[in-house]
Interface confidence: low
């Protein structure tokens, strides 16, 4: 069986200051079981954005049906962007664990640059 | 299977504003997705007006954004729009459709209502 | 905004023939490109997806391909009820925008 891959389609977005961002992913298989997290940033000092599993991210929401059983889809949309905004998304799978889950694969990542605000 | 239904007064004064409903069956707008508006005037082509998330999270087109104002109910399961000002260039048939374009793959719209006409005249 | 522009405006076309349809970007859209199928007096109905994937329920017949800035939609052997208007639509870059329509009428 094909091992999960995480597709980020778009190597970037670009998003006026002020409006909404779409970060798309998804995977190739529903295995390993386990959920998905959004960081900005890779490494120790990165920023978790959104957990499946957990959490309250009043200005992310998911443009799917995640609780759907076949879900692969596990695209992303944040509101109210600004230049804070800026940086390199990774949508990333983690597998199952006890007592903790396990980070098991990285998509390649989506930098979102904000534009000025339109006049 | 999902079904949309739009409604509303088919006839506007210029200036005033228009008012439109999409009620949704068959599925829940808090489960996911976007939902659209889109247009066509008379005899032309298609215009997207801008989309909704069930959280409010808008996205609109740019040439109508300063009177546009779309809206959710999700207790009604209906989403809704607003466009001030009007005047007989908004005279068009109003669809309202679900947005499955924000996703990965990218479908597009794929389920519409019937459409509905407003008129924009005095 | 992108501009979708398609040709011909209107295809003639004898029952049983291949059609073919053109569907150009004024920029790229990656394959983030659908193409819809609009009969008189009803709502436009989603045909193909990603550029090539045919929407649940769509005849084989229909076909997408194309990536960037050109698309093509084939209809290998026109059926009466396919005489129709067929719109593309970016969705890659916002606003999300139509072609001005392809008209296929019968010859």
């Known amino acids: 069986e094909d091992e999960l891959q995480v597709i980020q389609p778009e190597k970037s977005v670009s998003v006026a200051a002020g409006e909404s961002a779409t970060l798309r992913c998804a995977m190739t298989s529903l295995i390993p079981v386990g959920p998905i997290m959004w960081f900005r940033g890779a490494g120790a000092g990165r920023e978790l954005i959104y957990n499946q599993k957990e959490g309250h991210f009043p200005r992310v929401t998911t443009v799917s049906e995640l609780t759907k059983r076949n879900n692969l889809d596990f695209s992303i949309s944040i509101s109210n962007i600004t230049p804070a905004d800026a940086g390199t998304y990774y949508c990333v799978k983690f597998r199952k664990g006890s007592p903790d889950d396990v980070e098991f694969k990285s998509g390649a990542g989506t930098e979102l640059s904000v534009r000025a605000k339109p006049s | 299977q999902v079904q949309l239904q739009e409604s509303g007064p088919g006839l506007v004064k210029p200036s005033e504003t228009l008012s439109l409903t999409c009620a949704v069956s068959g599925y829940s707008i808090s489960s996911g997705y976007y939902w659209a508006w889109i247009r066509q005037p008379p005899g032309k082509g298609l215009e997207w007006i801008g989309s909704?998330?069930?959280?409010?999270?808008?996205y609109y087109n740019p040439s109508l954004k300063s009177r546009v104002t779309i809206s959710v109910d999700t207790s009604k399961n209906q989403f809704s729009l607003k466009l001030s000002s009007v005047t007989a260039a908004d005279t068009a048939v109003y669809y309202c459709?679900?947005?499955?374009?924000?996703?990965?793959?990218?479908?597009?719209?794929?389920?519409w209502g019937q459409g509905t006409t407003v008129t924009v005249s005095s | 905004e992108i501009v979708m522009t398609q040709s011909p405006a209107t295809l003639s076309v004898s029952p049983g023939e291949r059609a073919t349809l053109s569907c150009r970007a004024s920029q790229s859209v990656s394959s983030n490109l659908a193409w819809y199928q609009q009969k008189p007096g009803q709502a436009p109905r989603l045909l193909i997806y990603g550029a090539s994937t045919r929407a649940t329920g769509i005849p084989a017949r229909f076909s997408g391909s194309g990536s960037g800035t050109e698309f093509t939609l084939t209809i290998s052997s026109l059926q009466s009820e396919d005489f129709a208007v067929y719109y593309c639509q970016q969705l890659n870059i916002h606003p999300w925008t139509f072609g001005g329509g392809t008209k296929v009428e019968i010859k």
């Open positions: 909704i998330y069930h959280s409010g999270s808008t």
């Open positions: 459709a679900r947005d499955r374009s924000r996703g990965y793959p990218v479908y597009g719209m794929d389920v």
